[in-house]
């Protein structure tokens, strides 16, 4: 029996060198969120603890900014940032809810060519 639901930004794309906001929202439950962890595949990016606030992993400090809200902002995107991202909500008394986002980082030249292309 699942009580709450995680809504995410789903599959998103962004341009190399740009920034993107990763957002998740927990709904349909009255459970109290005690902590949210953000992971990129097998790496911990950031933690937002209800009492202690935000902690950004040292290896991502230069390119990851907390917020807005419980979301996460990724900056100076590279093609290597393409992949799965997970928001993991720890709640009381329900337990843990996990949402998945797939980010594709596009070469800026691809985006530019795409914008200029016109059908005759």
């Amino acid at each position: 029996m699942m009580t709450g639901t995680i809504e995410t930004t789903g599959n998103i794309s962004a341009e190399k060198g740009g920034s993107i906001i990763l957002q998740c929202h927990l709904s349909s439950t009255t459970a109290q969120v005690t902590q949210v962890n953000w992971e990129q595949q097998d790496q911990l990016l950031a933690i937002c603890n209800a009492d202690l606030g935000w902690h950004i992993s040292p290896s991502f400090k230069d390119r990851v900014a907390p917020g807005p809200g419980l979301g996460l902002t990724l900056q100076s995107l590279t093609v290597n940032d393409t992949g799965e991202y997970f928001c993991i909500y720890h709640t009381y008394p329900d337990g843990t809810y996990t949402g998945r986002i797939f980010l594709e980082v596009l070469e800026s030249s691809v985006a530019e060519h795409g914008a200029r292309f016109q059908i005759p």
């Epitope: 029996m1 699942m2 009580t3 709450g4 995680i6 902590q35 962890n37 992971e39 990129q40 595949q41 097998d42 790496q43 911990l44 997970f86 993991i88 720890h90 008394p93 329900d94 337990g95 843990t96 809810y97 996990t98 949402g99």
Partner: nanobody, 127 residues
Framework: EVQLVESGGGLVQPGGSLRLSCAAS????????RGWFRQAPGKGREGVAT???????????TYADSVRGRFTISRDNAKNTLYLQMNSLRPEDTAVYYC?????????????????WGQGTLVTVSS
């Protein structure tokens, strides 16, 4: 196929301690939702404790109100084993304890539906 085998049950006096183990095979996902459940004589099965872990380092444990502060769920990655440390045991903790694993990690808690179950181990708390 996932297989779960519990051990460690037995007879213990009120106020005593016991540690249950659950050896898992075939459950090798990077994100895991595992838990302990129990079924007392003549009652339905209830969630006791669950543990969400990921290869990214996330480790979130959740407990039923009736055991919070007395029971601790943990795991040994190298042995692929789940544990339940039970302290300050009470007669009402008497039950068959089951280890369980869930395929999906969208929700991991004592009220989640689990996919794989062990055969159970009996814990009796009596003087």
């Amino acid at each position: 196929e996932v297989q779960l085998v519990e051990s460690g049950g037995g007879l213990v006096q009120p106020g005593g301690s016991l540690r249950l183990s659950c050896a898992a095979s075939g459950y090798t996902y990077s994100r895991k939702c595992r838990g302990w459940f129990r079924q007392a004589p003549g009652k339905g099965r209830e969630g006791v404790a669950t543990l969400y872990t990921s290869s990214g380092g996330t480790y979130f444990d959740t407990y039923a109100d009736s055991v919070r502060g007395r029971f601790t769920i943990s795991r040994d990655n190298a042995k692929n084993t789940l544990y339940l440390q039970m302290n300050s045991l009470r007669p009402e903790d008497t039950a068959v304890y089951y280890c369980a694993a869930r395929l999906s990690t969208d929700f991991c808690g004592p009220r989640a539906d689990f996919d794989y179950w062990g055969q159970g181990t009996l814990v009796t708390v009596s003087s």
